[in-house]
């Protein structure tokens, strides 16, 4: 919290090289979406073109678990992806510019915390530095949105109808058209992260269904019609 | 306002225990890192300990490892050193401070003062 | 070890400028921070990363960090200046010194 920082000014503009990293307090993003984090540094090792590693890690500077490593061979400008937890993670940066920023993709909950970037010189200059206080993700909960629905062909001439949601909390999915009772037909799908799909195996009338998900943030809701072509007698 | 309040300290025999308590208030304890700094009489300030956020994340003075260890509450807003196997030359005014968001510290106690005599 | 060297005393005449060094390897790597403490009194941090000056802390305070040795500058120094100066930095392996200290006499 900023209210306990101590304000600056400068006291004299000599641009020495050291060690630093510049992150901010705070990235805040929805559910679902991504985000970057951003990470600059500085160092004292003038024109270092040897084989470096960028890292970020959660939870804890220095020992908290790695969601995202990568090396980079000497003179390359390329960092070759080692590791990318759930493979979500992906270095916007360059780190041979000075630049760790760290993309995340498909955000949930749960990666609500702080991460902390760190880089590692392993050739002649054999330094590391990482930051101390990290930047603060967090990420804030997202209502349901229903993102696709269809009427699909199904066995034996019959229809089925699907409707995929997302959300988080993952909302849950209810179908109701004009059949007594197939509400409960509903088959909750494979939920994808923060998407649920539910789908309705048999559409035994003409009409309309309707596909709600809803979580504690609220609901949303859409239809699909469903009129069969019946030939003349 | 911002402010670190030292307590604990006190005479106490060589080999014996004391355990130091530092309360914060003015700011959100748990989102800085933590140290405690030394200063025996009439010497200069010697770096003792750092404690992380969550208190996972520990560093210790090659003078006092094996034999202190700090901890912090956050619930709490207090910070923690447990000192064991005292000895004379352990003798001095113990600060907490706060780390600010760059290389320093920016926030200091007032000290209290541990004497290690026989 | 890591170590930072400071002169132990400095003198100065009042309005006169003070200049306080302070080396060691670290300095190389590492921004340096400076505290002032007067007797009986907690430090105070007067300049971070070399060069900066937090809020409160007058303007003829500044620092500067050139290879392995960095410097603390009081321009016009003040009666209320006389002190002990203290340098610090980090070090590699995440560690912190802080320099022996250097007591400032103002003159007069």
């Known amino acids: 919290d900023a209210s306990g920082d101590l304000l600056n000014t400068e006291a004299h503009s000599a641009p020495a090289q050291r060690w630093s990293m510049q992150v901010p307090a705070e990235v805040n993003a929805e559910a679902g979406d991504a985000a970057v984090l951003p990470c600059t540094f500085t160092h004292p090792h003038r024109h270092y073109d040897g084989p470096l590693t960028a890292i970020w890690r959660s939870g804890e500077p220095y020992a908290g678990p790695q969601v995202f490593r990568c090396t980079a061979a000497p003179g390359s400008e390329l960092c070759q992806t080692a590791l990318s937890l759930h493979g979500r993670f992906r270095l916007l940066g360059n780190p041979r510019r000075n630049d760790l920023s760290l993309r995340v993709e498909r955000l949930a909950l749960a990666d609500s915390g702080r991460y902390f970037c760190r880089v590692e010189f392993t050739g002649d200059a054999h330094d590391r530095y990482e930051s101390r206080h990290g930047v603060r993700l967090r990420v804030t909960a997202a209502a349901p949105r229903i993102v696709n629905i269809s009427v699909l062909p199904g066995p034996a001439h019959a229809f089925r109808a699907l409707c995929t949601a997302e959300g988080e909390p993952p909302p849950a999915l209810a179908w109701s058209g004009p059949a007594p009772g197939n509400s409960s037909a509903a088959l909750q799908g494979q939920g994808h992260g923060y998407q649920v799909t539910a789908e309705l195996p048999a559409l035994t009338r003409d009409g309309r269904y309707t596909c709600t998900a809803a979580n504690s943030l609220g609901r949303a809701e859409a239809s699909v019609y469903l009129f069969r072509f019946h030939g003349a007698p | 306002q911002v402010q670190l309040v030292e307590s604990g300290g006190g005479l106490v025999q060589p080999g014996g225990s004391l355990r130091l308590s530092c309360a914060a208030s003015g700011f959100t304890f748990s989102n800085y890192w933590m140290t405690w700094v030394r200063q025996a009489p009439g010497k200069g300030l010697e770096w003792v300990s750092f404690i992380s956020y969550s208190g996972s994340t520990t560093y210790y003075a090659d003078s006092v490892k094996g034999r202190f260890t700090i901890s912090r509450d956050n619930s709490k807003n207090t910070l923690y050193l447990q000192m064991n196997s005292l000895r004379a030359e352990d003798t001095a005014v113990y600060y907490c401070?706060?780390?600010?968001?760059?290389?320093?510290?920016?926030?200091w106690g007032q000290g209290t003062l541990v004497t290690v005599s026989s | 070890d890591i170590e930072l060297t400071q002169p132990p005393s400095v003198s100065v005449a009042p309005g006169q400028t003070a200049r306080i060094s302070c080396s060691g390897d670290?300095?190389?790597?590492?921004?340096a921070s400076w505290y002032q403490q007067k007797p009986g009194q907690a430090p105070v941090l007067v300049i971070y990363d070399d060069n900066k000056r937090p809020s409160g802390i007058p303007e003829r305070f500044s620092g500067s960090n050139s290879g392995n040795t960095a410097t603390l500058t009081i321009s016009g120094t003040q009666a209320e200046d006389e002190a002990d100066y203290y340098c610090?930095?980090?070090?590699?392996?995440?560690?912190?010194?802080f320099g022996g200290g250097t007591k400032l006499t103002v003159l007069g």
């Open positions: 610090a930095s980090f070090t590699y392996m995440s560690d912190f010194v």
């Open positions: 670290a300095l190389r790597s590492y921004y």
């Open positions: 401070a706060r780390e600010g968001t760059s290389s320093m510290f920016d926030v």
